[in-house]
Interface confidence: low
């Protein structure tokens, strides 16, 4: 007898690698047998020529190549989104709408976040060298590799975390030239060579002249950000020194810094930067947002004078360089619910205070922006009406709100209720893949606060916003 | 792999200005690294000229320090000489370098552009 | 500043060994040193780091054959089994900072020939 249809095989989120093609599964039931039609962000696919798409006769869509994409909004070189695929089965009895299946293409970018120093340790230290890999999508895993060799993470010896290279204790056979590699499924990465030289505890019975030199750390300065290093440059400052005393001059000096712990603290360890500098040097590798402590260490072959008086720095907060990551928009019951992720720590540039969260206008909430306090991710938005959604969120700092999200849309097509008892149906797409409808929401919200924590009431119909805890 | 590549003329009057490129790829001029002047007189003896390290500070040879400057363009990832006033004595190959790890220690050099100084 | 002094010229035979010395003024005694090889219109290479310990730390690419090491002021770059393809200008070079004037000095080099 005659049944409407219903999806038995959904179509599944997937990586387009490669040459490709991909391809995108949906069966159905139904008598009589439904036809397949498949949708990219809500809209049908032509498949007429030049259109890279597909349909199989068993209702597998083929995608041969990538289609085009949007501008990333986030600083990335690429958008790794391709879309949602959606797809519908219909007979004369109904339509049955599968789940949506994203898309999206492996990226890696060509520079690391974090590139490794050259370090110089004495044996029996604790040695780090840090890298950040670059951005890329699948997330890249890192090795590190010793003088053109992969280095055999041997337990209690070497320790990866978060892309950083943890030496436990450095012995001589630790120096060399260290490479970090970041690797996805869209290729390989290597960090610059990092020189790691390992001496011998300090010997006070060899002629260390160095010794009778005394140094001065007079200032440490802030600098002004250099505009050729691009929008968001970190901080850098300028150490200056004076060097008295009988001995030889110093061959080589190198600052160490750490970041001030709370008084009773144990100090964090210094990290330790060979200066290009004989009375004054340029020092980065910091944060904004924290305080630090500085010293400067001259030093001579194995011989290391004694090290300079500390001064300490506070750097001021900034507003987030990046956007939260992962920002979606999913129906709740009566509500649209948005969560998200924060930025990258690299990029907080200080204490993340909170979130600001933009409605855009001509959707079915009118322009609105709330204020999400501490460390929520989540923020709930009660409203029953039809219609396309679409947000932006901020991180926000003492400095104020960073750059927004990319904006991300949920299309309701039908009243609230119906949502709520079937959310898989509708997933969230980019506003790029609404742009005929939304064009004017490119412009995007303006980011000036006057306060940065002055919750914004905004009432209309019967919508309210609540705040929900993220655990 | 890094590699730096010399540009400029080969031939300049005595009392005029020496100017050169070095243009740098494979590695960001502003992620890392002294960009070095290095030139090579007719003798084959070698002196360093001075650097721009990456963040924008420079040093000069102190012999040099009246009349070199040594400036930058990040966003093309090129370094610049120039030598003021010069005469036949700073006829020379002139070689673009940067160290890989020690500060004064340059694995990595330019093929050389030879400058001669004559009217 | 320092002052690097070199030989003129060496020569040694093929398969042979060598031992190239720069000396640095006694003012400058424990200083580190780096060793460079150069062929006929090519650039100088960076073959490696002594330090006034004698520890070396060879560039990428170098033979076994190259060594370093250090005595008192001299620094010697000790080359073994000697290859046609060693025959080059070796120049060794020292970075200084003398009364907050920093800077590179270069010896004058030393002709090396294979017989």
């Known amino acids: 007898q005659d049944s409407p249809p219903q999806i038995l095989v959904h179509p599944q989120d997937q990586l387009f690698q490669g040459p490709g093609p991909a391809r995108m599964s949906c069966r159905a039931s139904g008598q009589p047998p439904p036809t397949i039609r498949w949708l990219l962000n809500g809209q049908p696919l032509s498949m007429v020529p030049p259109d890279p798409h597909h349909l199989l006769p068993d209702g597998t869509l083929l995608l041969l190549q990538p289609p085009a994409r949007g501008h990333a909004h986030d600083g990335q070189a690429l958008s790794t989104d391709l879309g949602v695929y959606t797809c519908e089965a219909s007979n004369r009895l109904g339509t049955a709408v599968s789940r949506g299946a994203r898309l999206s293409v492996a990226v890696l970018r060509e520079d690391f976040q974090i590139q490794p120093r050259d370090m110089v340790a004495v044996v029996g230290e604790q040695l780090t060298l840090e890298c950040g890999p670059p951005w890329g999508h699948p997330e890249p895993t890192v090795s590190w590799w010793k003088d053109g060799k992969p280095l055999v993470l041997q337990p209690g010896r070497y320790t990866v975390s978060g892309g950083s290279l943890l030496m436990a204790r450095a012995e001589k056979s630790d120096a060399g030239a260290y490479m970090c590699v970041a690797a996805n499924s869209a290729g390989h990465r290597e960090s610059r060579a990092a020189r790691v030289s390992i001496q011998e505890p300090q010997d006070y019975t060899e002629p260390v002249e160095l010794l009778a030199v005394r140094i001065q750390l007079e200032n440490v300065t802030l600098l002004n950000p250099d505009p050729a290093k691009g929008p968001k440059p970190g901080p850098a400052v300028w150490l200056s020194w004076k060097v008295s005393g009988p001995a030889a001059p110093a061959q080589s000096y190198t600052a160490l810094f750490r970041t001030q712990t709370a008084p009773g603290d144990q100090g964090a360890p210094w990290t330790e930067e060979l200066l290009a500098g004989w009375q004054s040097a340029e020092l980065g590798g910091l944060h904004w947002g924290q305080d630090y402590e500085f010293k400067v260490r001259p030093s001579s072959g194995r011989a290391r004078g004694p090290d300079s008086n500390v001064l300490l720095l506070r750097l001021p907060e900034k507003v987030p360089s990046a956007p939260p990551q992962e920002v979606t928009l999913k129906p709740g019951n009566g509500s649209v619910l948005v969560s998200w992720v924060p930025p990258s720590a690299e990029n907080h540039n200080g204490t993340i205070r909170g979130y600001q969260v933009w409605s855009l206008g001509n959707t079915s909430l009118p322009p609105a922006n709330w204020t999400v306090v501490g460390e929520q991710t989540q923020l709930e938005i009660a409203t029953r009406m039809p219609g396309s959604y679409c947000v932006q969120v901020a991180a926000v700092t003492g400095a104020g709100a960073g750059e927004p999200s990319s904006p991300v849309c949920l299309l309701l097509e039908q009243a609230m209720e119906r949502a709520t008892r079937e959310p898989s149906e509708h997933g969230p797409w980019t506003l790029e893949q609404l742009r005929v409808d939304l064009e004017v929401l490119f412009q995007g919200p303006g980011s000036g606060l006057n306060d940065i924590f002055e919750a914004q009431k905004i009432e209309w119909h019967e919508a309210r916003a609540h705040h929900h805890h993220h655990h | 792999q890094i590699q730096l590549q010399e540009s400029g003329p080969g031939l300049v009057k005595p009392s005029q200005s020496l100017s050169l490129t070095c243009s740098v790829t494979?590695?960001?001029?502003?992620?890392?690294?002294?960009w070095t002047w290095i030139r090579q007189f007719p003798g084959n003896n070698l002196e360093w000229m001075g650097y721009i390290s990456y963040a924008g500070g420079i040093d000069y040879n102190p012999s040099l320090t009246s009349r070199i400057s040594i400036t930058r363009d990040t966003s093309r990832n090129q370094f610049f000489l120039q030598l003021e006033s010069v005469t036949t004595q700073d006829t020379a190959t002139y070689y673009c370098a940067t160290p890989g790890g020690y500060p004064f220690h340059f694995d990595y050099w330019g093929q050389g552009t030879m400058v001669t100084v004559s009217s | 500043q320092p002052v690097l002094t070199q030989s003129p010229s060496a020569s040694a035979s093929l398969g042979a060994s060598v031992k190239l010395t720069c000396t640095l003024n006694s003012q400058f005694s424990t200083y580190n040193i780096g060793w460079y090889q150069q062929h006929r219109d090519k650039p100088p290479k960076y073959v490696m780091f002594?330090?006034?310990?004698?520890?070396?730390s060879k560039a990428d690419g170098i033979p076994d054959r190259f060594s370093g090491s250090s005595s008192g002021a001299d620094r010697y770059l000790t080359i073994s089994n000697i290859q046609a393809e060693d025959e080059a200008i070796y120049f060794c070079g020292a970075d200084y900072n003398n009364a907050g004037q920093y800077g590179c000095v270069f010896g004058s080099g030393t002709h090396f020939t294979v017989l």
């Open positions: 002594v330090k006034g310990d004698g520890g070396h």
């Open positions: 494979g590695y960001s001029i502003s992620s890392g690294s002294l």
